[in-house]
């Protein structure tokens, strides 16, 4: 075995060789040492750093039968699928007693066709809208020059002459493909082909044209869609949730939206079956053969109030002398707004009609004029909202009050001396 004085000479009798190859290559580095006594563990260094997870194998062969005899130790480091991170200076390292021995270095290099670190990705873009594509490649050998291609046509006269890592596209009007060639001294590598799909631009100026209690008419201006005509537009409406609040640009409404499709042109749509006096948010997107545009921001809209759709229910009218007691219940039909009150009309056979605003009460006591001998007295009631009166109930005749019939005490309403205004009799 190699010997020196008390500080030993290097035990290495074989040092790592050199490997140079293309990416993906598999190779082995080997070092051999001869030591006296117990064989040490061989460590591998790359650029002076111990490789903790090295794929290495160690073989030990005794050269005699005594424990003090020499051993041959061989360590092999396997490099599978060579990558740039594998390149560098490799050495073997052993600790013998309190001494550290490092072999002569071997070198691992990478040389081959360019390797893509970044390639153009598929994406969608709105028509006539600028965007960027990225491509990055490396050797060795360097330099690596890039050449961009659009629909297989080079965008520069030669590699390295046009845009390099980033390609700025000012806008497209049709779906196109882009790829990138990387050139170095070893040859050419071609990137994946990215498909850039041209979608319609987001519609603009979504607005209300007209409003009804249960329908809204909306219109918008379509965006550019390149060479692809719009096939239809889709409108979504959702009930506004004050708790959530749909902010502009918020991704999705809190509940399932009401979706309607509009043939185009015209870029207008009547949304029906809505609730009256209700806040909604609406948005629109338009579609071509290439796909849909992005949605517009949510636009807050509101249906107006309507009049009640039915008359008050269960009207009863009883008479006791000069007093008449009338009561009713809220209409069962939709109110289509906020109930503001009730109107009551009564009329005798030969007397003019009297019209009264009762407010929100659902009962009234009428003080009839004279001795109460007005004959064939009938009463009608209608509910009203800010939008107006709902339908009047059918005339209800005044029944005579019979003893034993309960008649609660009610606030008396004096019959006005002259009618407030006249209502045409039905």
């Amino acid at each position: 075995a190699p010997r020196g004085t008390q500080a030993e000479e290097s035990p290495f009798v074989g040092n790592p060789g050199n490997i140079t190859g293309a990416r993906g290559l598999t190779g082995t580095l080997r070092c051999q040492l001869q030591v006296q006594g117990e064989p040490p563990e061989v460590h591998w260094l790359r650029d002076g750093q111990i490789l903790e997870l090295a794929d290495s194998t160690q073989t030990q062969v005794p050269l005699g039968e005594d424990e003090q005899d020499d051993w041959i130790v061989v360590s092999q480091l396997r490099i599978t699928s060579l990558q740039l991170s594998d390149t560098g200076q490799y050495q073997c390292l052993v600790f013998l007693g309190h001494q550290t021995f490092v072999s002569q270095p071997g070198y691992v290099g990478l040389e081959g066709l360019p390797y893509f670190l970044e390639e153009p990705e598929d994406r969608t873009v709105a028509a006539n809208t600028p965007f960027n594509l990225s491509c990055q490649a490396q050797g060795p050998p360097e330099p690596v020059d890039l050449l961009w291609l659009q629909d297989a046509v080079p965008l520069a006269t030669a590699p390295g002459h046009g845009p390099q890592r980033s390609l700025h596209v000012p806008g497209l009007n049709k779906t196109s493909s882009f790829s990138c060639e990387a050139h170095n001294a070893k040859g050419v590598t071609t990137s994946r082909t990215a498909t850039i799909t041209v979608l319609p631009q987001q519609p603009r100026n979504l607005h209300l044209v007209s409003r009804q209690p249960t329908e809204l008419e909306v219109a918008w201006t379509p965006g550019l869609s390149g060479i692809y005509p719009l096939t239809h537009c889709t409108l979504q409406a959702v009930l506004s949730d004050d708790g959530m609040g749909i902010q502009a640009g918020e991704p999705d409404p809190p509940e399932e939206p009401l979706t309607s499709q509009a043939s185009v042109p015209p870029h207008q749509l009547r949304l029906g079956s809505l609730h009256p006096h209700t806040p909604y948010h609406i948005r629109v997107a338009c579609t071509s053969s290439q796909g849909p545009s992005s949605w517009t921001h949510w636009l807050p809209v509101e249906t107006p109030e309507g009049v009640p759709l039915g008359p008050p229910e269960n009207i009863s009218a009883t008479r006791n002398g000069s007093q008449a007691f009338v009561h009713w219940q809220e209409p069962r039909a939709p109110l289509q707004g906020t109930l503001l009150g009730y109107r009551l009309a009564y009329q005798g056979q030969d007397t003019p009609e009297v019209l009264m605003d009762i407010g929100l009460r659902q009962e009234v006591t009428l003080e009839l004029q004279g001795d109460g001998s007005v004959s064939n007295l009938t009463v009608c009631v209608a509910a009203y909202t800010a939008a107006g009166d709902g339908p009047w109930s059918l005339p209800v005749p005044l029944e005579a009050w019979r003893p034993g019939q309960a008649q609660p005490v009610h606030q008396l309403v004096k019959e006005p001396s002259t009618p407030a205004f006249s209502w045409p009799w039905w």
Epitope: Q6, A7, Q36, G37, F95, G97, H98, Q99, T100, V102
Partner: antibody, heavy 118, light 101 residues
């Protein structure tokens, strides 16, 4: 030529801390471990442990675990011995010594005398 | 740990005399791991013989070492005045230990 030069003598009170340096020259510092050896007054040599200068890993003999710490300043080719909470029995001369294969110690520092007195 | 016992603990010698110091190990050690040091009064120890029988650089040829297993010895073939010192054996087979000198 190879040299190990240690810091000068130290006079300390019980409970204090001392840090002794050992500067190496004339060889590649990280290729040889550094041993520390204690010699009490009038006594023999006692191995305290060593530090692997390549990876910085210390090893302590059983009697020197706890209050004793080996460290390195590789860029300055210097090894250190620190003794915390000094006791009277820590008095003596401390040597650094270069380690070789088969655990021999081929070069020694001149020694650093540590006196502990209240 | 392996205990090393040196004998004699002290000895007087005359110039020209042949001196032998023994070192007995409490359990067997490989001869590769037995070393000898010389320490003169007021000086650091100095490596004298390594791996049982190899002379360290600069050590006169009158020094020699031998042994195996548990029994090792250091011999000064012809004693000289400059050889007055304490001699330590040291083993590195397990936890490092020195003889008492």
């Amino acid at each position: 030529q190879i040299q190990l030069v240690q810091s000068g003598p130290e006079l300390k009170k019980p409970g204090e801390t001392v840090k002794i340096s050992c500067k190496a020259s004339g060889y590649t510092f990280t290729n040889y471990g550094m041993n520390w050896v204690k010699q009490a007054p009038g006594k023999g040599l006692k191995w305290m442990g060593w530090i692997n200068t390549y990876i910085g890993e210390p090893t302590y003999a059983d009697d020197f675990k706890g209050r004793f710490a080996f460290s390195l300043e590789t860029s300055a080719s210097t090894a250190y011995l620190q003794i915390n909470n000094l006791k009277n029995e820590d008095m003596g001369t401390y040597f650094c010594a270069r380690g070789t294969t088969f655990y021999a110690m081929d070069y020694w520092g001149q020694g650093t005398s540590v006196t502990v007195s209240s | 740990e392996i205990v090393l016992t040196q004998s004699p603990t002290t000895m007087a010698a005359s110039p020209g005399e042949k001196i032998t110091i023994t070192c007995s190990a409490s359990s067997s050690i490989s001869s590769n791991y037995l070393h000898w040091y010389q320490q003169k009064p007021g000086f650091s120890p100095k490596l004298l013989i390594y791996r049982t029988s190899n002379l360290a650089s600069g050590v006169p040829a009158r020094f020699s070492g031998s042994g195996s297993g548990t029994s090792y010895s250091l011999t000064i073939g012809t004693m000289e005045a400059e050889d007055v010192a304490t001699y330590y054996c040291q083993q590195g087979s397990s936890i490092l230990t020195f003889g008492a000198g």
